[in-house]
Interface confidence: medium
Amino acid sequence: MAVTACQGLGFVVSLIGIAGIIAATCMDQWSTQDLYNNPVTAVFNYQGLWRSCVRESSGFTECRGYFTLLGLPAMLQAVRALMIVGIVLGAIGLLVSIFALKCIRIGSMEDSAKANMTLTSGIMFIVSGLCAIAGVSVFANMLVTNFWMSTANMYTGMGGMVQTVQTRYTFGAALFVGWVAGGLTLIGGVMMCIACRGLAPEETNYKAVSYHASGHSVAYKPGGFKASTGFGSNTKNKKIYDGGARTEDEVQSYPSKHDYV
């Protein structure tokens, strides 16, 4: 029951996370204009991964897409790539995890297959979350660098033909959405990986056992060995009853008189 709950919760958390990553990628507010020290606040600029917008206090908004691909900064291209990879991996992970859910029965799918699929989707969610966090962090770093460069440029003189002052930009809403969404996807992935351990079927590993008659007074007691799950304490198939039964690992080093009967 706890395994099903962990798997289900992991799926829901990852679903919310991936929806957030998609939303953040599509949002225009990755960076917003810092209006500090600006004499005219009627025009408000903000940028996304795909287009740049200008909004006025009147409500008028104009957005233009970055139609050029080669002319864009390499870092912006890298952020786009990271976010898309995150979305693709997350989408595949969601598809795999739907079939892996313990509460959903698909034909005669064994628990081992569901466990493997749960682990696969969990890893995909983790990588997806990391891609989103990395993408958002790279963009945030671009902004911080741009902000401090701009701050330095604001105090330059009026010499020369044309003076350029970079408009300072700060973190937009999309960055926070991206960070939270990436974190949720990551948490969901971890939960799926934890659920995978509980889903792993109990393996019945009977090792070859040699029985040695140690005397007429001791009879063999059946059920002396437990099936190993791989997670229990009896992983070495240690003998439970000292009724003369021994595993291959415990064969006597010195032959007894009964060995040659």
Epitope: S31, Q33, V40, A42, V43, N45, Q47, S52, V54, E56, S58, F60, E62, R64, Y66, T68, L70, G71, L72, P73, L76, N146, V162, Q163, T164, V165, Q166, T167, Y169
Partner: nanobody, 121 residues
Framework: QVQLVESGGGLVQPGGSLRLSCAAS????????MHWYRQAPGKQRELVAS???????HYADSVKGRFTISRDNSKNTLYLQMNSLRAEDTAVYYC???????????????WGQGTLVTVSS
């Protein structure tokens, strides 16, 4: 390289008119706000008028009703029509634009070199 070049300044009598132009040239992706500033000798630079991308205008109280700002988006040009000029309008007029260069992400603020307007009899 983006450049803002002002023209149209000169000597004019009080009550006269002048039309300033500011042409933005270079690889421009989008022009956002465009503004006219002025700086009189020994004074701080002040905002005269501004125009938004949709054409909404803002004016300093001292020039309202006398100056008109306009822009031609197809030519990337800003204009300032100055009527009923007074001696206190004497200053160097600067063109200012927030614009995004082609291949850029963020808008930068550009200034022209300035054009002198002298109102004297």
């Amino acid at each position: 390289q983006v450049q803002l070049v002002e023209s149209g300044g000169g000597l004019v009598q009080p009550g006269g008119s002048l039309r300033l132009s500011c042409a933005a040239s270079g690889s421009i992706f989008r022009i956002d706000g465009m503004h006219w500033y002025r700086q009189a000798p020994g004074k701080q630079r002040e905002l005269v008028a501004s125009i938004t991308p949709s054409g909404i205008t803002h004016y300093a109280d001292s020039v309202k009703g006398r100056f008109t700002i306009s822009r031609d988006n197809s030519k990337n040009t800003l204009y300032l029509q100055m009527n009923s000029l007074r001696a206190e309008d004497t200053a160097v007029y600067y063109c200012n634009a927030h614009l995004v260069k082609v291949g850029g992400v963020w808008s930068d603020e550009y200034w022209g070199q300035g054009t002198l307007v002298t109102v004297s009899s």
